[in-house]
């Protein structure tokens, strides 16, 4: 299969900026490349086909170029409607592989997350499972790392993250990380902690609780 690699995965920009997204194919696809724009909850919209041909109705600020293995999509002057995720797709072979996407986000000022930790509810414990939630509120940029520690032992593979869409008012994100354990495992341990790192924080922030004391 032909693999498609897009970069960057996130592009921070302001209205009026010129932005360029790159797509590389693992082997030559001539000019059999399309670009799509997708907004949350909506179907992808075709912008460009055959690498540089503008789909009807698409503004001329979208410019496609390239052939062989290297392709670019340029937005000459970014407009408010252009904040979205962009995908390239090759259609040289039957697999019609997509790139992993580039999210064009609103460039904000750096904001460190406010961090909160929540123990499982008594109601949930009755069901035999325990979910501990670490909430990161109103941060920018989106890259943040959450590490879970149980009695100071690092946890891996038993947590899931969910990130909100960028807030239209202040350009920030919020994130929840959920550590899921069986009730039996939860009750074997005492101290539950989430450690957060983010570029707005000079040092990691840790929030914790002692089971049975909250």
């Amino acid at each position: 299969d032909i693999q498609m690699t897009q970069s960057p995965s996130t592009l921070s920009a302001s209205v009026g900026d010129r932005v360029t997204i790159t797509c590389r194919a693992s082997q030559s696809i001539n000019t059999w490349l399309a670009w799509y724009q997708q907004k949350p909850g909506k179907a992808p919209k075709l912008l460009m086909y055959k690498a540089s041909s503008l789909e009807s109705g698409v503004p001329s600020r979208f410019i496609g170029s390239g052939s062989g293995t290297e392709f670019t999509l340029t937005i000459s002057s970014l407009q408010p409607d252009d904040f979205a995720t962009y995908y390239c797709q090759q259609y040289n072979s039957d697999s019609k592989m997509f790139g992993q996407g580039t999210k064009v986000e609103v460039k904000g000022t750096v904001a460190a997350p406010s961090v909160f930790i929540f123990p499982p509810s008594d109601e949930q414990l009755k069901s035999g499972t325990a979910s501990v939630v670490c909430l990161l509120n109103n941060f920018y940029p989106r890259e943040a790392k959450v590490q879970w520690k149980v009695d100071n032992a690092l946890q891996s593979g038993n947590s899931q993250e969910s990130v909100t869409e960028q807030d239209s008012k202040d350009s920030t994100y919020s994130l929840s990380s959920t550590l899921t354990l069986s009730k039996a495992d939860y009750e074997k341990h005492k101290v539950y902690a989430c450690e957060v790192t983010h570029q707005g924080l000079s040092s990691p922030v840790t929030k914790s609780f002692n089971r049975g004391e909250c």
Partner: nanobody, 126 residues
């Protein structure tokens, strides 16, 4: 390991300018992001600005970020050939008086500041 050394601090009048430098040595190829923080007496360390030094999969190298206090007045840049980052500070105010620290994250831990300089004093007089 990466070592960071700041320079360029000093005394300046309100409305004036200063350029701070941060020179990196050691395993500089492992730097992902270089940032400037500042700390005024009795206050917490505050984020000022950052620049993506080595592009990972997320942002292009050269992408810049600013804190509220710096936006519009300060400019962060870097010169990879010289392994040096810069903070150009214009329209300085007395409230910009602080110790300015250079910090860096690694490609392995891109959101954690594992490397810090010793700091350089900036004093803005009215």
């Amino acid at each position: 390991q990466v070592q960071l050394q700041e320079s360029g601090g000093g005394l300046v009048q309100a409305g004036g300018s200063l350029r701070l430098s941060c020179t990196a040595s050691g395993r500089t190829s492992s730097i992902h992001l270089m940032a400037w923080f500042r700390q005024a007496p009795g206050k917490e360390r505050e984020f000022v600005a950052s620049i993506i030094w080595t592009g990972g999969t997320t942002y292009y190298a050269g992408t810049t970020f600013y804190g509220d206090s710096a936006e519009g007045r300060f400019t962060i840049s870097n010169d990879n050939a010289r392994n040096t980052g810069y903070l150009q500070m214009n329209s300085l105010k007395p409230e910009d008086t602080a110790v300015y620290y250079c910090a860096a994250t690694s490609l392995e831990n891109p959101t954690r500041y594992d490397y810090w300089g010793q700091g350089t004093q900036v004093t803005v007089s009215s």
